[in-house]
């Protein structure tokens, strides 16, 4: 099969600090040296890019300085962390993997991870 399969967890619950982590794993049909990983958010049939990073196989994954994402790569597996999440950011986060080089190019799109974010309750005033 010429397509690339991408696997990611169906559901993840963000921490009380608004941090969610999940693994995006792809079955590479070719020997890529350059890979691009993009996290997309799908809400109400609208798709937006959350963050993206291109990395050379064997090297570290680097997102832009102002990105809300961080990640590490190991073989065909990428560990993604999204921070600064709030309840309104709850939604489906799709992992998109592109084998950019060498040719041929391959595209792989995961089914998405539903990330649930619950805003922490404000701390009650205390008399300490």
């Amino acid at each position: 099969c010429k397509a690339m399969h991408v696997a990611q967890p169906a559901v993840v619950l963000a921490s009380s600090r608004g941090i969610a982590s999940f693994v995006c794993e792809y079955a590479s049909p070719g020997k890529a040296t350059e890979v691009r990983v993009t996290v997309l958010r799908q809400a109400d049939s609208q798709v937006t890019e959350v963050c993206a990073a291109t990395y050379m196989m064997g090297n570290e994954l680097t997102f832009l300085d102002d990105s809300i994402c961080t990640g590490t790569s190991s073989g065909n597996q990428v560990n993604l962390t999204i921070q600064g999440l709030r309840a309104m950011d709850t939604g489906l986060y799709i992992c998109k993997v592109e084998l950019m080089y060498p040719p041929p190019y391959y595209l792989g799109i995961g089914n998405g991870t539903q990330i649930y974010v619950i805003d922490p309750e404000p701390c009650p005033d205390s008399d300490f």
């Epitope: 099969c1 010429k2 397509a3 993009t38 998109k96 041929p104 391959y106 595209l107 799109i109």
Partner: antibody, heavy 118, light 108 residues
């Protein structure tokens, strides 16, 4: 809203060159793959070339490899197709198209006609 | 290169009828990376379906896509006058991107 406007088409003799432009607006150019697709008169669609993101990666159809060069200027939000050594079979309407985030070409320009004839 | 073959070449139907268009790939290609386009004379193509079954923004629900393995289908449940056009399938899972030769849906 997203808009793609091509220009630069015209009549050119075989062996000569032409440069097409596609001005994009309404989106961040560097977040998408940008493609050229052509359609010969009365025929179907044929993908020509793609340029991705930072512009380092470019792929071409075998039919144009070595003759056509795709490039982009993100500061001007403009896509280019430099066509050299043109042949009669390159006669077509050339469309620029945006690669959708989840695949497919989600926006297309109106097209520009290139006629290669002596 | 993945070759896409569309059938039939021409489909003659009346408004209100159902249209079923087929797209077959020369080799196993995930239907997740297949798109359908509509093109009217003198106009640019318009994306209808991506990922084999997801409707693009603004596309009415009378258009639906399905498929698995090497076969994909575009269905138009009730043809409206504006649906008479040429339809193309395209695969975008691996380079080079390829299109089918098109199916013309004409008024009977």
């Amino acid at each position: 809203q997203v808009q793609l406007v091509e220009s630069g088409g015209g009549v050119v003799q075989p062996g000569r060159s032409l440069r097409l432009s596609c001005t994009a607006s309404g989106f961040t150019f560097s977040s998408y793959g940008m493609d050229w697709v052509r359609q010969a008169p009365g025929k179907g669609l044929e993908w020509v070339a793609v340029i991705w993101y930072d512009g380092r990666n470019k792929y071409y159809a075998d039919s144009v490899k070595g003759r056509f060069t795709i490039s982009g200027d993100s500061s001007k939000n403009t896509l280019y197709l430099q066509m050299n050594s043109l042949r009669a079979e390159d006669t077509a309407v050339y469309y620029c198209a945006r690669g959708g985030l989840l695949g497919g070409f989600d926006y297309w320009g109106q097209g520009t006609l290139v006629t290669v004839s002596s | 290169e993945i070759v896409l073959t569309q059938s039939p070449g021409t489909l003659s139907l009346s408004p209100g009828e159902r249209a079923t268009l087929s797209c077959r790939a020369s080799q196993s290609v995930s239907s997740s990376y297949l798109a359908w386009y509509q093109q009217k004379p003198g106009q640019a193509p318009r994306l209808l379906i991506y990922g084999a079954s997801s409707r693009a923004t603004g596309i009415p629900d009378r258009f639906s896509g399905s498929g698995s393995g090497t076969d994909c289908t575009l269905a138009i449940s009730r043809l409206e006058p504006e649906d008479f056009a040429v339809y193309y399938c395209q695969q975008y899972g691996s380079s080079p991107w390829t299109f089918g030769q098109g199916t013309k849906v004409e008024i009977k």
